[in-house]
């Protein structure tokens, strides 16, 4: 095939609070193509209800996100004239707010020397087998790292962060989830900011 792989992204981001709007965008190499979006493992019926004029532009809006929208998506584009592109890299669309919020803390302290590392601990009141630590920024989408509990049957996950520098803000939240529904996360923990000295 000669059609380059498209890019799939979410606006304003891929980790979305339940009830909030989000738009999945697929962008390929040619203007005249049609776009297709699909969810891995389970058909996403919401996609079939998107107006054709938006589908043709590669826009797939969700006015109010629910658990039904969560999942791993890919897109492609093409036509009978030009064939079909390869599928995009996956986009994991996560819906938050499914469970009560966990607690995020820094060990031994949120005050860290420049160049140093710190342990962030995410604790849940209920036993979950999945945790995610998300780094937040003023003008950037959260970057999240998943982890399992540090011990079997535990409701705590441990994340190592660093080396840190004073040149940016170090803001974190964590989430808990059930690995059977890996795209449905808890409410976010309160924001934790690391204070970098030096």
């Amino acid at each position: 095939g000669h059609l380059p792989k498209p890019t799939l992204w979410a606006e304003p981001g891929s980790v979305i609070t339940q009830g909030s709007p989000v738009t999945l965008r697929c962008q390929g190499g040619q203007e005249t193509q049609e776009y297709r979006l699909y969810r891995e493992k389970k058909t996403a019926l919401w996609i079939t209800r998107i107006p054709q004029e938006l589908v043709k532009k590669g826009q797939f809006p969700i006015p109010s996100i629910t658990w039904e929208h969560a999942g791993r998506y890919r897109c492609y584009y093409g036509s009978d004239t030009a064939g079909r592109s390869e599928s995009s890299d996956p986009l994991e669309l996560v819906v938050t707010g499914a469970y009560i919020k966990p607690t995020l803390s820094a060990q031994p302290s949120p005050v860290v020397n420049s160049g140093g590392n710190v342990i962030l601990q995410c604790d849940s009141q209920v036993a979950f087998d999945g945790f995610s630590l998300c780094k937040e920024g003023e003008d950037e989408h959260p970057q999240c790292l998943n982890s399992q509990p540090h011990a079997r049957g535990s409701s705590r996950a441990i994340f190592s962060v660093g080396p840190v520098s004073p040149s940016r803000r170090w803001w974190y939240r964590c989430y808990a989830y059930d690995s059977n529904s890996p795209y449905e996360w808890s409410l976010p923990s309160d924001l934790l900011e690391l204070l970098v000295l030096g």
Epitope: R36, T43, D80, S87
Partner: antibody
Framework: QVQLKESGPGLVAPSQSLSITCTVS????????VSWVRQPPGKGLEWLGI???????NYHSALVSRLSISKDNSKSQVFLKLNSLQTDDTATYYC????????????WGQGTSVTVSS | DIQMTQTTSSLSASLGDRVTISCRAS??????LNWYQQKVDGTVKLLIS???RLHSGVPSRFSGSGSGTDYSLTISNLEQEDIATYFC?????????FGAGTKLELK
């Protein structure tokens, strides 16, 4: 209505080349693709390749060195050429009209039987 | 390549029966599953695309279902003209691959 019809040599000697023509009607080769599929006697279906409306092609990786698909839009004909034939290329060869989004083949020719034998 | 497995190579049924033919993919194919019917004379027809979309002209007694890796084709009320071999095919990625086929015979 959409129709596809294959025509081939019937018998080809080993190491020779196979050429099959698929003549279509009811749709334009400038707008739609044509796919080739074969079926060895008593066995299942094997996808060989596709040529799209713009002339671009996709081939099965196992056959890419021996297979070429081309077309003549004005004559509504698609051509399959398979080189260096062996006895296990003996099969019924089908052309079909694929759709681009699900890669489903909506309409098929009746098939042409090819035997590779000396 | 994605392997498509039709574990039942032949199936015997009576006219009027409800018949289900199954197909399994070696990996998740996200509902990109098509079904074909091949008659004894070699004629091949598309029955269903994208798991459950009935192709034009196909009788409503045919239906498809499934998700992930497991799919099935159901004929709700078997008729004489349905005696044929049925193939599944994945359409998620190239190369396109087919199941080995399930031959439906009359009891």
């Amino acid at each position: 209505q959409v129709q596809l019809k294959e025509s081939g040599p019937g018998l080809v000697a080993p190491s020779q080349s196979l050429s099959i023509t698929c003549t279509v009607s009811g749709f334009s080769l400038t707008s739609y693709g044509v796919s080739w599929v074969r079926q060895p006697p008593g066995k299942g279906l094997e996808w060989l390749g596709i040529i799209w409306g713009d002339g671009s092609t996709n081939y099965h990786s196992a056959l890419v060195s021996r297979l070429s698909i081309s077309k003549d839009n004005s004559k509504s004909q698609v051509f399959l050429k398979l080189n260096s034939l062996q006895t296990d290329d003996t099969a019924t060869y089908y052309c079909a009209k694929p759709n681009w989004d699900y890669y489903a083949m909506d309409y098929w020719g009746q098939g042409t039987s090819v035997t590779v034998s000396s | 390549d994605i392997q498509m497995t039709q574990t039942t190579s032949s199936l015997s049924a009576s006219l009027g029966d409800r018949v289900t033919i199954s197909c399994r993919a070696s990996q998740d194919i996200s509902n990109y599953l098509n079904w074909y019917q091949q008659k004894v004379d070699g004629t091949v027809k598309l029955l269903i695309s994208y798991t459950s979309r009935l192709h034009s002209g196909v009788p409503s007694r045919f239906s498809g279902s499934g998700s992930g890796t497991d799919y099935s084709l159901t004929i709700s009320n078997l008729e004489q003209e349905d005696i044929a071999t049925y193939f599944c095919q994945q359409g998620i990625t190239l190369p396109l691959t087919f199941g080995a086929g399930t031959k439906l015979e009359l009891k």
